[in-house]
């Protein structure tokens, strides 16, 4: 099944996804979307990178880690219950049917009455499986339905890079990465 990640209402959610560029600066396009990974692209695209930069964002979605080193983990700011569901990370490796795609399930819990750390993130021990599982996730209840239009929001790439990325570094060090080249 999809690897499950949890966050509380009002917190930032973190969905990990990594690859290892074949050479420094030799990036691969990546897209993130709401909904399970379809045959092409990322369903309802919320963020994407190209061979050089992050070139499309939508409100509340950003890359916290160093995407130039292959950390394309998604952060969703200030989540609500509506953010629950399946997300698709697609690493668009050039060639004939080479894409790597991962379905990640985000579960949003109501905020606790007691104060909670503002950057709390809850990961399952199954995280490395996300990066070794190929193909499509199994049946589950979340559906795409009619996909809404997306509004662009300008987000500073520099600000994204300056954000705290220690957790992403820890995850990368676990060796759960896709190697390209």
């Amino acid at each position: 099944s999809e690897v499950e990640y949890r966050a509380e209402v009002g917190q930032n959610a973190y969905l990990p996804c990594f690859y290892t560029p074949a050479a420094p600066g030799n990036l691969v396009p990546v897209c993130w979307g709401k909904g399970a990974c379809p045959v092409f692209e990322c369903g309802n695209v919320v963020l994407r990178t190209d061979e050089r930069d992050v070139n499309y964002w939508t409100s509340r979605y950003w890359l916290n880690g160093d995407f130039r080193k292959g950390d394309v983990s998604l952060t969703i700011e200030n989540v609500t219950l509506a953010d629950s569901g399946i997300y698709c990370c697609r690493i668009q490796i050039p060639g004939i049917m080479n894409d790597e795609k991962f379905n990640l399930k985000l579960v949003i819990k109501p905020a606790k009455v007691t104060p909670a750390p503002t950057r709390q993130r809850d990961f399952t021990a199954a995280f490395p499986r996300m990066l070794t599982t190929r193909g499509h996730g199994p049946a589950e209840t979340q559906t795409l339905g009619s996909l809404p239009d997306i509004n662009l929001t300008q987000i500073s790439t520099l600000a994204n890079e300056l954000r705290d990325s220690r957790l992403a570094n820890d995850l990368r060090d676990s060796g759960a990465t896709i190697r390209i080249g």
Epitope: V39, E41, G43, V45, Q92, G95, I96, M97, L144
Partner: antibody, heavy 122, light 107 residues
Framework: EVKLVESGGGLVQPGGSLRLSCAAS????????MAWVRQAPGKGLEWVAN????????YYLDSLKSRFTISRDNAKNSLYLQMNSLKAEDTAVYYC???????????????WGQGTLVTVSS | DIQMTQSPSSLSASVGDRVTITCRAS??????LAWYQQKPGKAPKLLVY???TLAEGVPSRFSGSGSGTDFTLTISSLQPEDFATYYC?????????FGQGTKLEIK
């Protein structure tokens, strides 16, 4: 107005080659995945191949990928299908179709050309 | 491969009838399903995408529903121009696959 116009079909002998073209207009060609879909006489629809925005990624029906090659020229707003080692069972009307766009969302072949007939026969 | 099975294969109906065509996927395809209408000698025309969103210019008598593995296309009141062949198609797994078609004929 979105328009897709196929050309290049015709009669070819088994083992021969053919190159189909599709001229696109009325939309930003480089913002969309493109596809070829075929239909044998009196039969249903069969997907053949897809290509991403810049041509760097391609997708094929497994049984065709060793003989068919999809490509595109965004400067010319054109899509191509190179067909080699043609067989009688490749006889069909070949349609060019516009697929999903750069921001995802709409998963269906929204626009189709009129089709071009390929007949493989000796 | 994901198999798409349509039923019925053919259907006779009269103008004004309500008609439902079903499509079943062999695996979960979420809502990545499209419906097309094709008339003899013509290219297919997109009716519905993402299982339930009506394509631009399609009359509101057409509607799609379903998710996962079971989907339906409904025509609420058949018009003379609706007699055609209808196909479902999934956009979830590779290869993309179509149903075998449902031929809608005049009774």
């Amino acid at each position: 107005e979105v328009k897709l116009v196929e050309s290049g079909g015709g009669l070819v002998q088994p083992g021969g080659s053919l190159r189909l073209s599709c001229a696109a207009s009325g939309f930003t060609f480089s913002d969309y995945y493109m596809a070829w879909v075929r239909q044998a006489p009196g039969k249903g629809l069969e997907w053949v191949a897809n290509i991403n925005y810049d041509g760097s990624s391609t997708y094929y029906l497994d049984s065709l990928k060793s003989r068919f090659t999809i490509s595109r020229d965004n400067a010319k707003n054109s899509l191509y299908l190179q067909m080699n080692s043609l067989k009688a069972e490749d006889t069909a009307v070949y349609y060019c179709a516009r697929d999903v766009g750069y921001y995802g969302g709409n998963y269906g072949f929204a626009y189709w050309g009129q089709g071009t007939l390929v007949t493989v026969s000796s | 491969d994901i198999q798409m099975t349509q039923s019925p294969s053919s259907l006779s109906a009269s103008v004004g009838d309500r008609v439902t065509i079903t499509c079943r996927a062999s695996d979960n395809i979420y809502s990545y399903l499209a419906w097309y209408q094709q008339k003899p000698g013509k290219a297919p025309k997109l009716l519905v995408y993402n299982a339930k969103t009506l394509a631009e210019g399609v009359p509101s008598r057409f509607s799609g529903s379903g998710s996962g593995t079971d989907f339906t296309l409904t025509i609420s009141s058949l018009q003379p121009e609706d007699f055609a062949t209808y196909y479902c198609q999934q956009h979830y797994g590779s290869p993309l696959t179509f149903g075998q078609g449902t031929k809608l004929e005049i009774k």
